[in-house]
């Protein structure tokens, strides 16, 4: 039975040209995290494998930095980066947990972080 929950940074916004940290946290389970995939609307950005380390997809390697932790840092943001991001936790023996983050990249200098929220 899957008992864990994913806590994410929720809905966030950032300025064009700036950077943002995408962060998820898996709690309430003793399952072993084997891999975390970071995806943007069905496109794989990066994989953090417990044994193999980070694999950043080539088209993002110049502006995606691994970490902190299992999170992902997006740099040199453009308005095209606006959209949904998913952290997919592969765990053993529980299976897969998915968290969702919505990022809005703003032209203006006003960018505020949304509240944290949980997905069971």
């Amino acid at each position: 039975m899957m008992t864990g929950t994913i806590e994410t940074t929720g809905n966030i916004s950032a300025e064009k040209g700036g950077s943002i940290i995408l962060q998820c946290h898996l709690s309430s389970t003793t399952a072993q995290v084997t891999q975390v995939n970071w995806e943007q609307q069905d496109q794989l950005l990066a994989i953090c494998n417990a044994d193999l380390g980070w694999h950043i997809s080539p088209s993002f390697k110049d502006r995606v930095a691994p970490g902190p932790g299992l999170g992902l840092t997006l740099q040199s943001l453009t308005v095209n980066d606006t959209g949904e991001y998913f952290c997919i936790y592969h765990t053993y023996p529980d299976g897969t947990y998915t968290g969702r983050i919505f990022l809005e990249v703003l032209e203006s200098s006003v960018a505020e972080h949304g509240a944290r929220f949980q997905i069971p």
Epitope: N49, L52, G53, H55, P58, S59, Y92
Partner: antibody, heavy 119, light 106 residues
């Protein structure tokens, strides 16, 4: 086109070391990850380790830890694998595949380098 | 270490026949399973990634399925050029390969 060209066959004495090179063309190795996989005669495939040429970060299979060193020279777009303390069981074809764009699978392989360890 | 066990080890088949090769993992690996074809004296060639995702340039007769611990590579209608050894590989943990399945054409 995208390809990996490896150095030629080697014959080595037990206890010595071998260094195999893998030159990339058609892509920049800093944009991907280079792995080394070996195959003993008539046997299966065995992953040895990988390098992120952009950062120099390496990961090695436990079996080869302390005996294998993977490096790159990004100025020549070349990866290297050095295996030390050679024994007869290291006789194999050594391949340098690059990781696929979306994970730890191998989409382009070098032609292989036969390393023979014999006294 | 995750162990991958392929079956059969060897299969002799006739052209146009449907061929199924299985790969079983010693623990769940989600869909982190990839398939390769290796012909004699050649480097392996990627056929399928992530259990079922097709690869550009690979004939459509090759398909993959499965998740968790049980995976299948299917060749819908065998051709003479498909004589080769087929390997599965997992990327859920330290990278490991199956022992291989040799396909012979009758």
């Amino acid at each position: 086109q995208v390809q990996l060209v490896q150095s030629g066959a080697e014959v080595k004495k037990p206890g010595s070391s071998v260094k195999v090179s893998c030159k990339a063309s058609g892509f920049n190795i800093k944009d991907t990850y280079i792995n080394w996989v070996r195959q003993a005669p008539g046997q299966g495939l065995e992953w040895m380790g990988r390098i992120d040429p952009a950062s120099g970060d390496t990961k090695y299979a436990q079996k080869f830890q302390g005996r294998v060193t993977i490096t790159t020279d990004t100025s020549t777009n070349t990866a290297y694998m050095e295996l030390s303390s050679l024994r007869s069981e290291d006789t194999a074809v050594y391949y340098c595949p690059k990781s696929g764009d979306y994970g730890w699978y191998f989409d382009v392989w070098g032609q292989g380098t036969l390393v023979t360890v014999s006294s | 270490e995750i162990v991958l066990t392929q079956s059969p080890d060897f299969q002799s088949v006739t052209p146009k026949e449907k061929v199924t090769i299985t790969c079983r993992a010693s623990q769940s690996i989600s869909s982190n399973l990839h398939w390769y074809q290796q012909k004699p004296d050649q480097s392996p060639k990627l056929l399928i990634k992530y259990a079922s995702q097709s690869i550009s340039g690979v004939p459509s007769r090759f398909s993959g399925s499965g998740s968790g611990t049980d995976f299948t590579l299917t060749i819908s209608s065998l051709e003479a050029e498909d004589a080769a050894t087929y390997f599965c590989q997992q990327s859920n943990s330290w990278l490991t390969f199956g022992q291989g399945t040799k396909l012979e054409i009758k």
